[in-house]
């Protein structure tokens, strides 16, 4: 799996989308988990409704919400009031039994709020250092790593 980078502004909401094959994953619940290092375990943050037919209902865990368009094949995660500690590696998963298939690997980056001058030194402004070398920018909030590219950030 390539890793897609989603950038959000501190204090604002960030929407992460994970497209998937709706037929292949028919009847499966989905989940959003946080990975502890590139090779580490993925800790469940939030999952879709226990009843698959109600997957369209938004479910919250703290400031993270999940909703699933099972017909269109798009899982959407919302991170509300984004903070620096929300930065990290995540996965969108499709659940079947005790197993989980990775739909997308996501790196969340937190950018500085350009209107917030109080902590201007604490957060990254776009145009400063890049976490990824030669990363392809797809659009304003996400980019994918190139084939075979090592996702440079872990630390550990």
């Amino acid at each position: 799996h390539n890793t897609t980078v989603f950038q959000g502004v501190a204090g604002q909401s960030l929407q992460v989308s994970c497209p998937y094959d709706s037929m292949k994953h028919w009847g499966r619940r989905k989940a959003w988990c946080r990975q502890l290092g590139e090779k580490g375990p993925c800790q469940r943050v939030v999952s879709t409704h226990n009843l698959w037919l109600l997957s369209f209902l938004r479910r919250w865990n703290g400031s993270t919400a999940i909703t699933d368009d099972t017909l269109g094949g798009t899982l959407t995660i919302t991170l509300r009031n984004l903070q620096p500690h929300d930065a990290g590696l995540y996965q969108c998963q499709s659940l079947h039994g005790s197993e989980a298939d990775t739909l997308r690997k996501v790196l969340v980056e937190v950018l500085a709020d350009p209107l917030d001058h109080r902590d201007a030194g604490d957060l990254w402004f776009p145009g400063e250092s890049e976490s990824f070398e030669d990363a392809h920018v797809e659009h304003s909030i996400s980019r994918s790593l190139l084939e075979g590219e090592i996702p440079f950030p872990p630390t550990s």
Epitope: G37, G40, P84, L89, P151, P153, P154, T155, S156
Partner: antibody
Framework: QVQLVQSGAEVKKPGASVKVSCKAS????????IHWVRQAPGQGLEWMGW????????KYAPKFQGRATITADTSTSTAYMELSSLRSEDTAVYYC?????????????WGQGTLVTVSS | DIQMTQSPSSLSASVGDRVTITCHAS??????LSWYQQKPGKAPKLLIY???NLHTGVPSRFSGSGSGTDFTLTISSLQPEDFATYYC?????????FGQGTKVEIK
């Protein structure tokens, strides 16, 4: 018990090469990245490079590119670091270090260190 | 390479003191900073990962804070076993780089 056990101390002459081994027990090295870090006497820590034993990919600090070679043998769960063209300033304790990579690894294991002395 | 600068390079303190060590990164590293403790003749030990997360088994008197370029390691009440050298390390990009270390000595 989870641990990394390194090979013994080495004394080498300038211009020679040294190969230090690091054997993992209690875990599989394929599930980790193996880093090499060195520390000259009385000095700080210096990251040399890393290997992903599962993929065989390795990456080096620019200072060691071309002179250090990091390899791994998954069948014996052992990682190696070879440093060539040794000079006196390479005298240091060399540590291997295993973690789950970047982005918040919660796993962190270190070898006991191997003293390499370069002297004519 | 990203340069990591620690201050102070050494400090003298007494048991029970509150100790603060700072680490400055030459460029933005988000929260990808770890703190290590090293005692003479021993390998480093991870204390804090991701700037503020306490590693398993590390006493709660240790805490970390910061993001971006400025980070802090705090020992709320120094204990005899805490006299050691402390290093910060960035994990935003390779090569990973360490600060030069802060030696905490007995006053």
């Amino acid at each position: 018990q989870v641990q990394l056990v390194q090979s013994g101390a080495e004394v080498k002459k300038p211009g020679a090469s040294v190969k230090v081994s690091c054997k993992a027990s209690g875990f599989s090295i394929e599930d980790f990245y193996i880093h090499w870090v060195r520390q000259a006497p009385g000095q700080g820590l210096e990251w040399m490079g890393w290997i992903d034993p599962e993929q065989g990919d390795s990456k080096y600090a620019p200072k060691f590119q071309g002179r250090a070679t990091i390899t791994a043998d998954t069948s014996t769960s052992t990682a190696y670091m070879e440093l060539s063209s040794l000079r006196s300033e390479d005298t240091a304790v060399y540590y291997c270090h295993a973690d789950h990579g970047n982005y918040g690894s919660t796993m962190d294991y270190w070898g006991q260190g191997t003293l390499v002395t370069v002297s004519s | 390479d990203i340069q990591m600068t620690q201050s102070p390079s050494s400090l003298s303190a007494s048991v029970g003191d509150r100790v603060t060590i700072t680490c400055h990164a030459s460029q933005h590293i988000n929260v990808w900073l770890s703190w290590y403790q090293q005692k003479p003749g021993k390998a480093p030990k991870l204390l804090i990962y991701k700037a503020s997360n306490l590693h398993t088994g590390v006493p709660s008197r240790f805490s970390g804070s910061g993001s971006g370029t400025d980070f802090t390691l705090t020992i709320s009440s120094l204990q005899p076993e805490d006299f050691a050298t402390y290093y910060c390390q960035q994990g935003q990009t390779y090569p990973r780089t360490f600060g030069q270390g802060t030696k905490v000595e007995i006053k």
